[in-house]
Interface confidence: low
């Protein structure tokens, strides 16, 4: 598999991972102990047709074209968990793996 | 996990699973032995912000909105594979299992 | 006791190979990230590379073609293989896991051993 | 690839005054740095991640700063304890997967 990293001064218009903090903190999400802030990551960018697609069924829904079928969009294609220290809803601390926080790889599908 | 499915007649915006078939003699796709067609559903509608959002991630990147985040699109987020008999590049018959061919479940991601 | 324990560092001739060990104990190898980071005599410290969760390996681009990261979780050890070694490649040799730090980070080395010492001489 | 300049070089300072060092990347890192302590003999000890979080078991007198390209590390108050060389660190690009130390910070106490 393959995806594109960018950053704020890329040029790159295609469908592209790009950096990102998330600052729980700045949201003021006061239940999560840790981590305050981690690198999530995000997709960003045009999917052309072909480009970085994931799975055969992206080029073949686009071959039958279906009413309403929108193209491809740049969306996660990889991601991975992270550890959490949080509060619960009854205020018991919860240590847990959070599936899917970060984004690894860009693709269009 | 939660999906919606809908049909032809379904009024439905939001992010929705819609039945396809997939015809591979229609696409002239000869080198396929079997199946000649299948189902392989698609994913299509709105994703207005939280509405079956997979991920955690994509509401995180939401708060965050770093520049050029488009929101979330309608993707498929569960997929199955299929058996197939087809001709390989050398004219070799292959009998395969092939990855994320049919939509199973559509979401925001 | 969570620990790292490298090995196999002494004098190599310029041209020779060596390969070091990087024995762990207290965890479980294959969920962390494993780097080697090198220090010169009286210099600062450089990174060589990292094996992954998933046994990937990526490196310095000087470190390409000539050293290799490795991985034995039955020995929870980890290894550098390195050849082709020159007077300059002289360096105390650590081993370091990367950092649980709650988030995601590959680079965040928290734990490290006390180091081998790799000279390079004729 | 990204390059990391530290400076000073070398600082020297009297216990209980306050240490302030620079930390500057060649391009934008976001908050991708780490900084960490090392003495004569030891392997480097981890200090701070993400600019400003506090590793485990490292006193609150530490505390880092900074986004983009530019980074201080900050010591309140030094103790003798803290005199030692001091590194920032990357990560080379998004991919998490490549390392870039400063050439380190000196601190002496006078």
């Known amino acids: 598999d393959f995806g594109l990293d960018c950053d704020e001064h890329s040029t790159e218009s295609r469908c592209c991972r790009y950096p990102l903090t998330v600052d729980f903190e700045a949201f003021g999400w006061d239940w999560i102990i840790a981590p305050k802030r981690y690198k999530a990551n995000y997709c960003s960018g045009e999917c052309e047709f072909v480009f970085l697609q994931k799975y055969p069924h992206t080029h073949l829904v686009h071959q039958a074209n279906p009413r309403g079928s929108a193209g491809p969009c740049c969306t996660p294609t990889k991601m991975s968990p992270i550890n959490m220290l949080y509060f619960n809803g009854k205020e018991q601390i919860i240590y847990g793996k959070i599936p899917a926080m970060v984004v690894d790889r860009c693709g269009c599908s | 996990d939660f999906g919606l499915d809908c049909d032809e007649h379904s009024t439905e915006s939001r992010c929705c699973r819609y039945p396809l078939t997939v015809d591979f003699e229609a696409f002239g796709w000869d080198w396929i032995i079997a199946p000649k067609r299948y189902k392989a559903n698609y994913c299509s509608g709105e994703c207005e912000f939280v509405f079956l959002q997979k991920y955690p991630h994509t509401h995180l990147v939401h708060q965050a909105n770093p520049r050029g985040s488009a929101g979330p699109c309608c993707t498929p987020t569960k997929m199955s594979p299929i058996n197939m008999l087809y001709f390989n590049g050398k004219e070799q018959i292959i009998y395969g299992k092939i990855p994320a061919m049919v939509v199973d479940r559509c979401g925001c991601s | 006791e969570v620990q790292l324990v490298e090995s196999g560092g002494g004098l190599v001739q310029p041209g020779g190979s060596l390969r070091l060990s990087c024995a762990v104990s207290?965890?479980?190898?294959?969920?962390?990230?494993k780097g080697w980071v090198r220090q010169a005599p009286g210099k600062g410290l450089e990174w060589i590379g990292i094996i992954n969760i998933e046994g990937e390996t990526y490196y310095a681009s000087w470190a390409k073609g000539r050293f290799t990261i490795s991985r034995d979780n039955s020995k929870n050890t980890v290894y550098l293989q390195m050849n082709s070694l020159r007077a300059e490649d002289t360096a105390v040799y650590f081993c370091?896991?990367?950092?649980?730090?709650?988030?995601?980070?590959?680079?965040?080395?928290?734990?490290w051993g006390q180091g081998t010492l790799v000279t390079v001489s004729s | 690839a990204v390059v990391m300049t530290q400076s000073p070089a070398t600082l020297s300072l009297s216990p209980g005054e306050r240490v302030t060092l620079s930390c500057q990347a060649s391009?934008?890192?976001?908050?991708?740095l780490s900084w960490y302590q090392q003495k004569p003999g030891q392997p480097p000890k981890l200090l701070i991640y993400?600019?400003?979080t506090l590793a485990s078991g490292v006193p609150s007198r530490f505390k880092g700063s900074g986004s983009g390209t530019d980074f201080t590390l900050t010591i309140s108050s030094l103790q003798p304890e803290d005199a030692a060389t001091y590194y920032c660190?990357?990560?080379?690009?998004?991919?998490?997967?490549?390392?870039?130390f400063g050439q380190g910070t000196k601190v002496e106490i006078k």
């Open positions: 370091a896991r990367g950092h649980d730090n709650f988030g995601y980070s590959y680079h965040d080395f928290n734990l």
């Open positions: 391009q934008s890192i976001h908050h991708d």
């Open positions: 660190q990357t990560y080379d690009g998004i991919s998490h997967y490549g390392v870039a």
């Open positions: 993400l600019a400003s």
């Open positions: 207290g965890f479980t190898l294959s969920h962390y990230v």
